[in-house]
């Protein structure tokens, strides 16, 4: 799997999980989240050569097409596969609230 | 929806469905499919700017991050959303077989 266990241990130009820390205030302009101040969002990036973690039959076909037609602009792209939620603390006035924001953290990637 | 109805009628640099005809023999080296000789596979391509058809909370966050940090390399990618199967005819010896190949045709796209 193209997850932290594999991608963070290997130098990989191909599609893989990349570390990305996001600071809510600085990077998103969100002042309303009290805790955490930021989080490891991660992201997916890298080339999708033939048979590299292809997600669907279409992405396998596209990847093969690209190998045979290297001048073509049609190729699969490295995107998130498994995502996890993030629990945050924010305030309604002086009252603390806990909320779970879905699909905030990328755990693994795929070529799609 | 970033589908043929929208994308094939508009000149769009952003993430959209693009037409792509694949000839099985010429483009994939597949000689085993008798009919059709090729098909409209289509593919997804184009930029994923802020709020352009974001798929998940993470892709919205990434797109916002990219807007505020334009020098960043972390950005969502244009990939297939809805896929359809393709029915093919091939031969086992002299015996014709009909098979449905899943996820062969891209019908719409998303930024993920």
């Amino acid at each position: 799997a193209l997850d932290a266990a594999y991608c963070f241990r290997n130098v990989q130009d191909n599609c893989c999980l990349r570390p990305l820390y996001i600071d809510f205030k600085r990077d998103l302009g969100w002042k309303w989240i009290h805790e955490p101040k930021g989080y490891n969002a991660n992201f997916c990036a890298g080339a999708c050569p033939y048979l590299w973690s292809s997600d669907t039959q279409h992405s396998r076909v596209l990847s093969l097409y690209n190998t045979i037609n290297p001048e073509a602009s049609a190729s699969p792209c490295c995107v998130s596969q498994d995502l996890e939620p993030l629990t945050i603390l924010y305030y309604i006035g002086k009252t603390p609230k806990i909320e779970q924001l879905s699909n905030m953290i990328v755990k693994s990637c795929k070529c799609s | 929806a970033l589908d043929a109805a929208y994308c094939f009628r508009n000149v769009q640099d952003n993430c959209c469905l693009r037409p792509l005809y694949i000839d099985f023999k010429r483009d994939l080296g597949w000689k085993w499919i008798h009919e059709p000789k090729g098909y409209n596979a289509n593919f997804c391509a184009g930029a994923c700017p802020y709020l352009w058809s974001s798929d998940t909370q993470h892709s919205r966050v990434l797109s916002l991050y990219n807007t505020i940090n334009p020098e960043a390399s972390a950005s969502p990618c244009c990939v297939s959303q809805d896929l359809e199967p393709l029915t093919i005819l091939y031969y086992i010896g002299k015996t014709p077989k009909i098979e449905q190949l899943s996820n062969m045709i891209v019908k719409s796209c998303k930024c993920s």
């Epitope: 969100w30 309303w32 924010y90 | 909370q57 916002l64």
Partner: antibody, heavy 120, light 108 residues
């Protein structure tokens, strides 16, 4: 510079619903928090509720709960306030406003206001 | 809900004079959950002060806010002709946000 542009005046019958829009520009919509405030003719200001558009977290004044819905469409940078079961006392100017960043906060930019008249 | 009571209801002063507007909360707001607005006829409110004492961008320094707990004050040091309007205080310590009933500042 943030600009909030609201939809035009509405005349509604008692018992019906009204949906007022508020389109934001000049700032990243996904970083904004929007509140809705109303003002009856010759009266003071009354807060109805607020929303964090990117995560759809909304907070409503108890007296409007069940009657008001605040939503956001990120693709058009627009916030909507829908008020149902209208009565004559809902006749007011309805304002959207962006807060300084929190769900409950001071409001630094305001729309031009939308007059909603409820009359049979 | 937190009730805000503004006084006086109407204040009649001349340009150049000092105006002192009061806002009292029915429960403690702490030191930073109060804002002041100015509203002129046919216009939307305009934020003057937030966090009890911080001036909003572009607000002249003749406007100042003070107070904490339950008692807050808006002071206009030297009244200009354009300052005659209705002033509202607003609390955002608790939901729902509430506003005072307003103080009308009129030319004497």
């Amino acid at each position: 510079q943030v600009q909030l542009v609201q939809s035009g005046a509405e005349v509604k019958k008692p018992g019906s619903s009204v949906k007022v829009s508020c389109k934001a520009s000049g700032y990243t919509f996904s970083s904004m928090v929007i509140s809705w405030v109303r003002q009856a003719p010759g009266q003071g200001l009354e807060w109805m509720g607020g929303v964090i558009p990117i995560v759809d977290i909304a907070n409503y004044a108890q007296r409007f709960k069940g009657r008001v819905t605040i939503t956001a469409d990120e693709s058009t940078s627009t916030t909507y306030m829908e008020l149902s079961s209208l009565r004559s006392e809902d006749t007011a100017v309805y304002y959207c406003a962006s807060t300084l960043g929190l769900v409950l906060d001071a409001m630094d930019y305001w729309g031009q206001g939308t007059l909603v008249t409820v009359s049979s | 809900e937190t009730v805000l009571t503004q006084s006086p209801g109407t204040l009649s002063l001349s340009p150049g004079e000092r105006a002192t507007l009061s806002c009292r909360a029915s429960q403690s707001l702490g030191s930073s959950y109060l804002a002041w607005y100015q509203q002129k006829p046919g216009q939307a409110p305009r934020l003057l002060i937030y966090g009890a004492s911080s001036r909003a961008p572009g607000i002249p320094d003749r406007f100042s806010g003070s107070g904490s707990g339950t008692d807050f004050t808006l002071t206009i040091s030297r009244l200009e002709p354009e300052d005659f309007a209705v002033y509202y205080c607003q609390q955002y310590a608790d939901s729902p946000i509430t506003f005072g009933q307003g103080t009308r500042l009129e030319i004497k």
